[in-house]
């Protein structure tokens, strides 16, 4: 097996992630491990000098630069907050707070925003990753209601008057529940008449 | 050689108090993160604590946050563990580990051979 | 914190044959930005420390034998022996390192048949 630094005449190495290709020596050498940085360059007698990142920065891939990337926290003010802290393999990870969604991203996300509310009748469709785009509000399924302004709240099913031992005064909608009254309780004049029906 | 050496375990009374030290050779040992991992008898591997290269970032499992302090000194090549206010559940082997990291947060390459701490009246 | 699920308990297996053993966790390991499970496997045999087999999952640690391979992504793992050998009377742990408290297995113990 041969192991670098060895020449290549055809400007590719045999593993793309492990080495790269010095067109000054027409070599290829080896990249240096997640977590590390080249602290001295490869040359025709000598592989690539590998050295830990120091604290506060990372590099998260096999890599040939010359320094590691600088740590950096998800910032409150642009609506972030953090899942994972930053290690000399990895960058910080973050994710929008609670109630926000990602309004702008650039490989990453980099500023969230509010979600919107959802009237009364309709409640936000469950997405597959939080925060990840703002609320599509979808009416309430049939038996169901939300009666609030909110960007979480979810529609309940209307009360069953009969579970509890009572009877159906006013049937529900979709912005309010089943209104319920004891079976003993005279309905109210206006009415009668369909009660008598 | 790599080496990590426990000392500083023993028979302690609850409510009792004990530091444990590991001794680092064989690399630089500021470069790189270290924590504490115990071990009850019969039973899982626990992550206790961690701590940053600098010694700048420390980090404890909820069972021991607010009891135990984890701290280093570079100059020494030393990783302590201060243990107040000790439980019966405490009881364990405690190993020191490195990780290959300038932060805690990553796999253990190297283990010490574990110094066991019992707390009991 | 990330709880960490293995099976079996424990696993007979004739010399030579292969040992399968399964590790999953609560939630998704995998980092999107560089495609690596952090995910490590540790073998400890009686009275000795946890020894480091695998990490990202699949990475052999240097000196390892290639009869050991990590495989899976995101939530599910496996720690696989191709060819038991007595040496490999162990147990065997899994472990999560993509969020603090870094978290572990219960272990599965390895004999032979």
């Known amino acids: 097996q041969v192991v670098p630094p060895y020449g290549s005449e055809n400007q590719t190495c045999r593993d793309q992630e492990k080495e790269y290709y010095e067109p000054r020596h027409r070599i290829c050498c080896s990249r240096c491990p997640p977590g590390t940085y080249v602290s001295a360059k490869c040359s025709r007698s000598r592989d690539t000098v590998c050295a830990t990142c120091a604290e506060n920065s990372y590099n998260e891939h096999w890599n040939y630069l010359t320094i590691c990337q600088l740590c950096r926290p998800c910032d409150p003010v642009m609506g972030l907050e953090e899942i994972a802290p930053c290690t000399s393999k990895r960058k910080t990870q973050c994710r929008c707070q609670p109630g926000m969604f990602c309004a702008a991203w650039a490989l990453e996300c980099t500023h969230c925003e509010l979600l919107s509310d959802c009237p009364p009748g309709t409640e936000a469709e469950l997405k597959d990753e939080v925060g990840k785009g703002n609320n599509h509000c979808v009416p309430c399924k049939a038996g169901h209601f939300q009666n609030t302004s909110s960007p979480s709240a979810r529609c309940q099913p209307h009360t069953r008057c009969e579970d509890q031992g009572l009877v159906e005064a006013a049937p529900g909608t979709a912005q309010s529940d089943t209104t319920c009254r004891n079976p003993s309780e005279s309905l109210p004049p206006e009415m009668s008449g369909t009660m008598l029906m | 050689e790599v080496q990590l050496v426990e000392s500083g375990g023993g028979l302690v009374q609850p409510g009792g108090s004990l530091r444990l030290s590991c001794a680092a050779s064989?690399?630089?040992?500021?470069?790189?993160?270290m924590s504490w991992v115990r071990q009850a008898p019969g039973k899982c591997l626990e992550w206790v604590s961690g701590?940053?290269?600098?010694?700048?970032?420390?980090n404890y499992a909820d069972s021991v946050k607010g009891r135990f302090t984890i701290s280093r000194d570079n100059s020494k090549n030393t990783l302590y563990l201060q243990m107040n206010s000790l439980r019966a559940e405490d009881t364990a082997v405690y190993y020191c580990?490195?990780?290959?990291?300038?932060?805690?947060?990553?796999?253990?390459?190297?283990w010490g051979q574990g110094t066991m701490v019992t707390v009991s009246s | 914190d990330i709880v960490m699920t293995q099976s079996p308990d424990s696993l007979a297996v004739s010399l030579g044959e292969r040992a399968t053993i399964n590790c999953k966790s609560s939630?998704?390991?995998?980092?999107?930005?560089?495609?690596?499970?952090?995910l490590t496997w540790y073998q400890q045999k009686p009275g000795q420390p946890p020894k480091l087999l695998i990490y990202?999952?699949?990475t052999r640690e240097s000196g390892v034998p290639d009869r050991f391979s990590g495989s899976g992504s995101g939530t599910d793992f496996t720690l696989t022996i191709s060819s038991l050998q007595a040496e490999d009377v162990a147990v065997y742990y899994c472990?999560?390192?993509?969020?603090?408290?870094?978290?572990f297995g219960c272990g599965t113990k390895v004999e032979i048949k």
């Open positions: 472990q999560q390192y993509f969020n603090t408290p870094p978290t």
């Open positions: 701590i940053s290269g600098s010694g700048g970032r420390t």
């Open positions: 064989g690399f630089t040992f500021s470069s790189y993160a």
């Open positions: 939630q998704n390991v995998l980092y999107s930005s560089n495609n690596k499970n952090y």
């Open positions: 990202w999952a699949s």
């Open positions: 580990a490195k990780s290959d990291n300038w932060h805690y947060l990553d796999a253990f390459d190297i």
